[in-house]
C-alpha cells in the first residue's frame, strides 16, 4: 500500500499460546544497565501496547504468558505463502525525553526458510526496521514512504530447532542505534516482506553516563551525545565539606562511560574522605589542610575536644612555634644540661656537659653560652663582652662541648650553658642552665701604657704609671729600662715594686729613652713602647707632672 | 468462520478417476498451503502431500507420486485431488487440511469433513 | 522416510486420571512435531504443534513436551470427550503420521 493511513487500530488479539519458556531468559533480561534509560520495553508492558498491524491478516499478536502468567506482547507473522508481502507493526509514540541518539534492542525469532515444508520460493530471511521523527503523539498516520529505514534485520543464527516447553528457545538480539533526533518523539515501525518472524520483545533505550560520585565530585546523569564518537565534557561539583583548587571534569562516551578524569575535589580542613564523603573529624584528631589525606590522632602533648578541628592546642607548658605545621608535637623548653665540667690551661678554658634530662619532647635542642667575668673582690659580675671568642660558637651549638679562646688570664668566670629548643623563647619560665666557675691561670701581663713624668732636674727624672690594663696576675715587681737617646746598647736597669721610679746621675740638657715592664709569677711582660724624656739644664727650673704624649 | 467443505461420498470401479474437491472460505486461500490425508477404514491417517497455493507448486509423498495430481482454482478458493487408474487399495476417506505455517512449528488447523471414496467393481 | 512409533497402541483410563501418550521417531525430529485428536466419525483436530505449543482454543490440561526422538502428550485429568484415538505427526522431513494411540474408557 502507498499509506499506513487508516491502519487497522483494532487491539491485536490472536490465540492464547503457552508459556514458551522463552519467558525465563527475558525475564532474567529485564533489569538492563544502569547507563541505559528505557523509552518502551515491551516486556514490562502490562495491558494493551497500542501497536497496530496494517494489513489487518499480517503481522498479528499472540498472548504469550511467562512462568508467572504476566502477560509477553509477542507479535508474529509467517505469510510464506504470498509473494510481494509487505505487512507493517507500527509502535505506539515514543518519547525520547531529550536524548538525541537511541537504541533499539529487537528480541525475535526467525525461522529458517528451509526448515519450512515444500522449499518455498517467496520464504525470506530478513525483516525491515523504520522510524518517523515526530512531536505529535497521534501522528503515526502517514505515508510508508515518509518513515527512514534503519536497517534490514537478519537473524545471526536462524534456527531450526524450536525449543519451548521443557527446552529454551534460541532468541535472536539485534541491536540498531538512530541519531541525531530531534523532535520530542517517535515511531518504529518494523515491515515483514515474507519472513516467517516472531518479534518477542522491543526495547527502545537511550544511553546515560549515570551518576556518579568520583575524586569526592558528583557528576550527575549525563545522556550522551548524538554522535557514536563524541566525548561530552561534564563539570562535577564538590561533595559536602570538600573544595578543590583544580576544577572536576569528566567526560562522558557515546557508550555511557565516564572517561579521562581531570581534577578532583578533596576534604576541607577538618573532614576526611570516607566512602566517598567527606567526613568530620572526631575529638581527638585533626586535618590542617583539604591536601592532607585523612584525620590524624592529635600530635603528642597536644588535645582538641572539637569535632572538624583544623589544628590541636598545646597542652599546659607545651607550645608549638608559629613556623611549626600542626601535625608537629608541642614541646617544653629543655631542663637544664647535666654534669658541666672544665678544664683550663694558659690559652683556653674548655667546657663540657651532657645533655639534659628533659629535652621537652623535640629533637632540636641546642645550646647557648653565657660567660660573665667576676671581680672576686666586690662580688659583682658582668657579661663577658667581646674578648672571649668561642669555638665552634657561642649560640646554636648542637654538640655538648666548647672551647673558649684568649681568656683574661687570672681571672674568675662564671659560664652559664644554657639547653634551649625551638620554643624556649615562649615560655614564661625561669631559663634552665647550668653554671661553671672558672678562675684562669697568672700569665705574663700586658704592656705598661699610660707613663707620666714627675719631678725633672738637672740629673734626675721621676715617673709614675698606671697598672697594666691586664696584669694577668699579681705584679711581683717592674723593671725599668732607660738610656741616652741614640745610646741604646749602653742602658741602665731599674727595678721597682711600686708604680714610681726616680732615675739619678743623668746628663743634665739630655734626653733619656724609658721603658717599662712589669712581672707576675708566670715572667715579664713585654716592653712598655719608649717614653722620651729630657733632664733641665744646668741653669734650668724643674718641671713637675707632665704626662707624656 | 473459517472452513474447508468437501464434497459427498464417491463410489468408482477400478480403473476409474475420480477428482475430489476442497472449497475454503473465512481466509485468504493463497496464505496457508494445503495438505492431502488418506485414512483407510479402520487405519490410521496418512499424508499423502501439499500444494503451494500461492504458487500451485505440489509436494508428494512417498507412495503418492504418478496416480495423484493436487490442483487449484484459485478463482473459487478450491483445491483438487484427482486419482487416476483407482484400485480397490484406494478406498479410504480423504482429507484435505490447511496447512499453518508459524514461527513455532507447523500444523494443520483445519480441515475439511473428509470425502469416502469407495473403489468397488 | 522417518517412522513415528506411537504407544501404547491403547490406553485404558477413567475419567479424572492423568493419560500419557508416548511418541518415538527413529532418527531426530528436533521439535517439528505435532499431535491430533480424531473422535469416530470426524476429521482430525491439531491439539500441538512445534512439540508443545498448544493450538487455537485447546484446553491447558493438554500439554506437551520432548525433543529429538522421544515426545510425549499429557492429559492431566482426562475429561469424557477426551476418548479418542490420537496421532502424532513429524515435519522434520516430509512428513509422516505415528499409528494412533486410543484412549479408552475404563
Known amino acids: 500500500p502507498a499509506s499506513l493511513a487508516g491502519c487497522y487500530s483494532a487491539p491485536l488479539k490472536g490465540p492464547l499460546w503457552t508459556c514458551l519458556l522463552l519467558c525465563a531468559a527475558l525475564r532474567t533480561l529485564l533489569a538492563s544497565p544502569s547507563n541505559e534509560v528505557n523509552l518502551l520495553d515491551s516486556r514490562t508492558v502490562l495491558g494493551d501496547l497500542g501497536w497496530i498491524a496494517f494489513p489487518k491478516n499480517g503481522w498479528e499478536e499472540i498472548g504469550e504468558v511467562d512462568e508467572n502468567y504476566a502477560p509477553i506482547h509477542t507479535y508474529q507473522v509467517c505469510k510464506v505463502m504470498e509473494q510481494n508481502q509487505n505487512n507493517w507493526l507500527l509502535t505506539s509514540w515514543i518519547s525520547n525525553e531529550g536524548a538525541s541518539r537511541i537504541f533499539i534492542e529487537l528480541k525475535f525469532t526467525l525461522r529458517d526458510c528451509n526448515s519450512l515444508p515444500g522449499g518455498l520460493g517467496t520464504c525470506k530471511e530478513t525483516f525491515n526496521m523504520y522510524y518517523f521523527e515526530s512531536d505529535d503523539e497521534n501522528g503515526r498516520n502517514i505515508k510508508d514512504n515518509q518513515y527512514i529505514k534503519i536497517d534490514t534485520i537478519a537473524a545471526d543464527e536462524s534456527f531450526t530447532e524450536l525449543d519451548l516447553g521443557d527446552r529454551v528457545m534460541k532468541l535472536n538480539t539485534e541491536v540498531r542505534d538512530v541519531g541525531p533526533l530531534s523532535k520530542k518523539g517517535f515511531y518504529l515501525a518494523f515491515q515483514d516482506v515474507g519472513a516467517c518472524i516472531a518479534l518477542v520483545s522491543v526495547r527502545v533505550y537511550y544511553k546515560k553516563c549515570p551518576s556518579v560520585v568520583r575524586h569526592l565530585a558528583v557528576f550527575p546523569d549525563t545522556i550522551t551525545g548524538a554522535d557514536s564518537s563524541q566525548l561530552l565534557e561534564v563539570s562535577g561539583s564538590c561533595v559536602n565539606h570538600s573544595v578543590t583548587d583544580d576544577p572536576p571534569k569528566m567526560h562522558c562516551s557515546a557508550e555511557g562511560e565516564w572517561l579521562v578524569p581531570i581534577g578532583k575535589c578533596m576534604c576541607k580542613a577538618g573532614y576526611e574522605e570516607k566512602n566517598g564523603t567527606c567526613q568530620v573529624c572526631r575529638p581527638g584528631f585533626f586535618k590542617a589542610s583539604p591536601h592532607s589525606q585523612t584525620c590524624s590522632k592529635c600530635p603528642p602533648h597536644s588535645y582538641t575536644h572539637e569535632e572538624a578541628s583544623t589544628s590541636c592546642v598545646c597542652e599546659k607548658d607545651y607550645f608549638r612555634r608559629e613556623s611549626d605545621p600542626p601535625t608537629m608535637a608541642c614541646t617544653r623548653p629543655p631542663s637544664a644540661p647535666r654534669n658541666a665540667i672544665s678544664n683550663v690551661n694558659e690559652t683556653s678554658v674548655f667546657l663540657e656537659w651532657i645533655p639534659p634530662a628533659d629535652t621537652g619532647g623535640g629533637k632540636d635542642v641546642s645550646y647557648y653560652i653565657l660567660c660573665k667575668k667576676c671581680n672576686s673582690h666586690a662580688g659583682v659580675c658582668e657579661e663577658c663582652g667581646g674578648h672571649v671568642r668561642y669555638l665552634p660558637q657561642q649560640i646554636g651549638l648542637k654538640n655538648t662541648s666548647v672551647m673558649m679562646a684568649d681568656p683574661l688570664a687570672h681571672t674568675n668566670y662564671t659560664f652559664e650553658i644554657e639547653a634551649v629548643n625551638g620554643v624556649s623563647d615562649l615560655s614564661p619560665g625561669t631559663r634552665q642552665y647550668v653554671s661553671v666557675n672558672v678562675t684562669t691561670n697568672q700569665a705574663a701581663p700586658s704592656p705598661v701604657t699610660n707613663v707620666k713624668k714627675g719631678k725633672i732636674a738637672k740629673n734626675s727624672i721621676s715617673l709614675s704609671w698606671q697598672e697594666p690594663d691586664r696584669p694577668n696576675g699579681i705584679i711581683l715587681e717592674y723593671e725599668i729600662k732607660y738610656f741616652e737617646k741614640d745610646q741604646e746598647t749602653s742602658y741602665t736597669i731599674i727595678k721597682s715594686k711600686e708604680t714610681t721610679i726616680t732615675a739619678e746621675g743623668l746628663k743634665p740638657a739630655s734626653v733619656y729613652v724609658f721603658q717599662i715592664r712589669a712581672r707576675t709569677a708566670a715572667g715579664y711582660g713585654v716592653f712598655s713602647r719608649r717614653f722620651e724624656f729630657e733632664t733641665t739644664p744646668v741653669f734650668g727650673a724643674s718641671n713637675d707632672q707632665s704626662q707624656i704624649p | 468462520q473459517v472452513q474447508l467443505l468437501q464434497s459427498g461420498a464417491e463410489v468408482k470401479k477400478p480403473g476409474a478417476s475420480v477428482k475430489v474437491p476442497c472449497k475454503a472460505s473465512?481466509?485468504?486461500?493463497?496464505?496457508?498451503?494445503m495438505s492431502w490425508v488418506r485414512q483407510a477404514p479402520g487405519q490410521g491417517l496418512e499424508w499423502m502431500g501439499w500444494?503451494?497455493?500461492?504458487?500451485?507448486?505440489?509436494t508428494y509423498a512417498q507412495g503418492f507420486t504418478g496416480r495423484f495430481v493436487f490442483s487449484l482454482d484459485t478463482s473459487v478458493s478450491t483445491a483438487y485431488l484427482q486419482i487416476s487408474s483407482l484400485k480397490a487399495e484406494d478406498t479410504a476417506v480423504y482429507y484435505c487440511?490447511?496447512?499453518?505455517?508459524?514461527?513455532?512449528?507447523?500444523?494443520?488447523?483445519?480441515w475439511g469433513q473428509g470425502t469416502l471414496v469407495t473403489v468397488s467393481s | 522416510e522417518i517412522v513415528l512409533t506411537q504407544s501404547p497402541a491403547t490406553l485404558s483410563v477413567s475419567p479424572g486420571e492423568r493419560a500419557t501418550l508416548s511418541c518415538r521417531a527413529s532418527?531426530?525430529?528436533?521439535?517439528?512435531l505435532a499431535w491430533y485428536q480424531q473422535k469416530p466419525g470426524q476429521a482430525p483436530r491439531l491439539l500441538i504443534y512445534g512439540a508443545s505449543t498448544r493450538a487455537t482454543g485447546i484446553p491447558d490440561r493438554f500439554s506437551a513436551s520432548g525433543s529429538g526422538t522421544d515426545f510425549t502428550l499429557t492429559i492431566s485429568r482426562v475429561e469424557p470427550e477426551d476418548f479418542a484415538v490420537y496421532y502424532c505427526?513429524?515435519?522434520?522431513?516430509?512428513?509422516?503420521f505415528g499409528q494412533g494411540t486410543k484412549v479408552e474408557i475404563k
Open positions: 500444494i503451494n497455493t500461492n504458487t500451485g507448486n505440489p
Open positions: 487440511a490447511r496447512v499453518r505455517l508459524t514461527v513455532y512449528g507447523d500444523g494443520m488447523d483445519v
Open positions: 532418527q531426530s525430529v528436533s521439535s517439528n
Open positions: 505427526q513429524q515435519y522434520g522431513s516430509s512428513w509422516t
Open positions: 473465512g481466509y485468504t486461500f493463497t496464505s496457508y498451503a
